[in-house]
Interface confidence: low
């Protein structure tokens, strides 16, 4: 009577030739303790004898008969709760149905468990999340419907044939609900992992290869771009032309839009892979990049620093400090925008060239009254000489000299 027996165990167990099988099992006999237990292989009920026929793998009866399989098959249960079994080693011809024939004082029951034994170690199964995005941590799962105390195994992760650096967490389950070995690997894929092969390798305790499963990574990523510029050093003179080309080295999914940015701001009406700048001015100097978007988001190229070279602009002089008191120190600074930076400066005092003064700064440690006047400068670089600016006035304050009485 089935209502008097309650069993819990995995419906089907999997193993391979030479491994072992551990069958977690619990039961409840409502009318008292177990008196007899027989484990059949592929049992069939014989109506004539009202008994089950089949290979007896294990027998535990009052008269203590022991089949020859007893060493290979172990009943690890008890008389009222536990019906756990172990078969070690397990063979290909063990595949089929295991029948647990249970008898108490008044009741009998045949419980069936499926056993699937393959010729070779079957492969694990890699489970990937539905979508993998670059730089977002995902968990790769490798699941094998096998675990047995007498046959240790390990699951190893490989990326393109090389062990993966990230530490994997392996767990096993040997419960009445499920039997499995699982390895979980937390992994932050980069775009360059797209299309690469990930392998979960089943190995025995000595690291010998048993089987594997492979998947090809589909890593969704923003477009990866390369920017090329002509001339290649991105250094031009005012009035020259510049061409920048944007190349998509990888995009998953396909790209949808293209734009160009200068110093972080989008350039209007520039939506092709080529940016042509004709007769450039110095105001067009700056950091350029292209931006290409797909469904994941925008990707940006490296920045190209465009240097538009020009002769020095009209210079100005800054004086620290004016008015100056006689005997104090004063510094003059020649300010002139130029690219490349000026290599030479010419200084003028009251319209006359100051000999030996060719630096950006002029320092006078001790001001005298005759230092007063207009100071101007001219900056020079490889492209030319700048226009001399209007200059600046130095006022020198000093006490009365040669006081005469009138």
């Amino acid at each position: 009577d089935s209502s008097k027996w309650v069993f819990e165990h995995p419906e089907t167990l999997y193993a391979w030739e030479g491994a072992c099988v551990w069958i977690p099992c619990t039961y409840r006999a409502l009318d008292g303790d177990l008196e007899s237990f027989i484990l059949f292989h592929n049992p069939e009920y014989n109506k004539n004898t009202s008994k089950f026929d089949g290979t007896r793998l294990y027998e535990s009866t009052k008269d203590g008969k022991v089949p020859s399989e007893q060493k290979r098959v172990q009943f690890l249960g008890d008389k009222n709760k536990n019906c756990t079994l172990s078969i070690h080693p397990v063979h290909l011809n063990d595949s089929g149905q295991l029948g647990l024939r249970m008898e108490s004082k008044t009741e009998k029951w045949m419980e069936r468990i499926h056993l699937n034994v393959s010729e070779r170690p079957f492969p694990p199964h890699i489970q990937l999340p539905p979508e993998i995005q670059e730089s977002q941590e995902v968990t790769l799962t490798c699941l094998l419907n096998f675990s047995c105390y007498g046959y240790p195994i390990q699951l190893q992760w490989l990326l393109e044939g090389v062990p993966m650096r990230q530490a994997a967490v392996t767990s096993t389950s040997l419960t009445i609900k499920s039997v499995f070995t699982r390895s979980e690997l937390k992994f932050s894929p980069q775009w360059s992992h797209h299309g690469k092969i990930v392998t979960c390798q089943l190995q025995d305790a000595d690291g010998k290869f048993l089987s594997n499963d492979t998947v090809q990574l589909n890593v969704k990523h923003t477009p990866k771009l390369e920017i090329k510029v002509t001339p290649s050093d991105a250094i031009v003179r005012e009035g020259d032309s510049v061409t920048m080309t944007c190349e998509v080295s990888s995009s998953n999914p396909e790209y949808t839009t293209v734009s160009w940015l200068k110093d972080g701001t989008s350039l209007k009406k520039q939506n092709t892979f080529t940016l042509n700048l004709r007769e450039v001015t110095k105001d067009q100097s700056g950091k350029y990049c292209c931006q290409v978007s797909n469904d994941v988001g925008p990707g940006r190229s490296e920045e190209v620093f465009l240097q538009v070279q020009y002769a020095p602009e009209p210079s100005t002089v800054q004086i620290l400090h004016s008015p100056a008191v006689e005997g104090s120190q004063v510094e003059f600074l020649c300010m002139s925008l130029a690219n490349p930076l000026p290599t030479n400066y010419t200084w003028y005092h009251n319209g006359k060239e100051m000999q030996g003064r060719t630096e950006e700064k002029v320092h006078i440690p001790k001001i005298l009254p005759w230092h007063a006047g207009t100071y101007s400068c001219v900056a020079e670089n490889i492209l030319g000489t700048g226009q001399r600016g209007p200059g600046a006035e130095l006022d020198v304050q000093y006490p009365p000299k040669k006081v005469t009485t009138v």
Partner: antibody, heavy 118, light 116 residues
């Protein structure tokens, strides 16, 4: 006891060729990826080449790509490094190294010396 | 780019504790690294690997005076009760597969001197 014994080093002229060998013992050779590393006199260590257990995956450092060939004979427990078009900057002590787990280079041979000079 | 940074030298008194640092490039702060010991005219010797969580496993024949730990992108090798035979260059290494190329990168090494 794990042992790695390199041989085949010596003097060679620039442009010449040489083959290094490494005899492994004390462990199951076919269970491990193997590497060649080198160390130039008074310089740091440099990885040269890697070969997987079954020779399916092979990697080379950019400095030797196209000139050096790594191979192994699992039946003979031997690792090889065939070197061609040798240059003076290939002068170094060459080490045969076992790789375990996550890139742990856990056993190193005593090394064999290569001098490339005219 | 995968880079390991080490200080070039360090001195410790006999019997003292030593702590060596190896810093990974910031984008690789989760990587496992390896420590190696190299004594003059000898090949490197594997000391241990150190993981991001600080757990470590030592190589064969390494005394339990050696231990590893971690903080952020820094990986440490600690030697308690340092002995004269511990005088050597300690080099950290890290491997990775980038695009289709395997690389194994070393730090510059820290030369450890034991005083007294």
């Amino acid at each position: 006891e794990v042992q790695l014994v390199e041989s085949g080093g010596g003097f060679v002229k620039p442009g010449g060729s040489l083959k290094l060998s490494c005899a492994a013992s004390g462990f199951t050779f076919s269970d491990y990826g193997m590497n060649w590393f080198r160390q130039a006199p008074e310089k740091g260590l440099e990885w040269v080449a890697y070969i997987s257990r079954g020779s399916h995956t092979i990697y080379y450092a950019d400095t030797v790509k196209g000139r050096f060939t790594i191979s192994r004979d699992n039946a003979e427990n031997t690792l090889f490094l065939q070197m061609t078009s040798l240059r003076s900057n290939d002068t170094a002590m060459y080490y045969c190294v076992r790789m375990a787990g996550y890139y742990a280079m856990d056993y190193w041979g005593q090394g064999t010396s290569l001098t490339v000079s005219s | 780019q995968l880079v390991l940074t080490q200080s070039s030298s360090a001195s410790f008194s006999l019997g003292a504790s030593a702590k060596l640092t190896c810093t990974l490039s910031s984008q690789h702060s989760s990587y496992i690294i390896e420590w190696y010991q190299q004594q003059p005219l000898k090949p490197p010797k594997y000391v241990m690997e150190v993981k991001k969580d600080g757990s470590h496993s030592t190589g064969d024949g390494i005394p339990d005076r050696f231990s590893g730990s971690s903080s952020g992108a820094d990986r440490y090798l600690s030697i308690s009760n340092i002995q004269s035979e511990d005088e050597a260059i300690y080099i950290c290494g890290v491997g990775d597969t980038i695009k289709e190329q395997f690389v194994y990168v070393f730090g510059g090494g820290t030369k450890v001197t034991v005083l007294g």
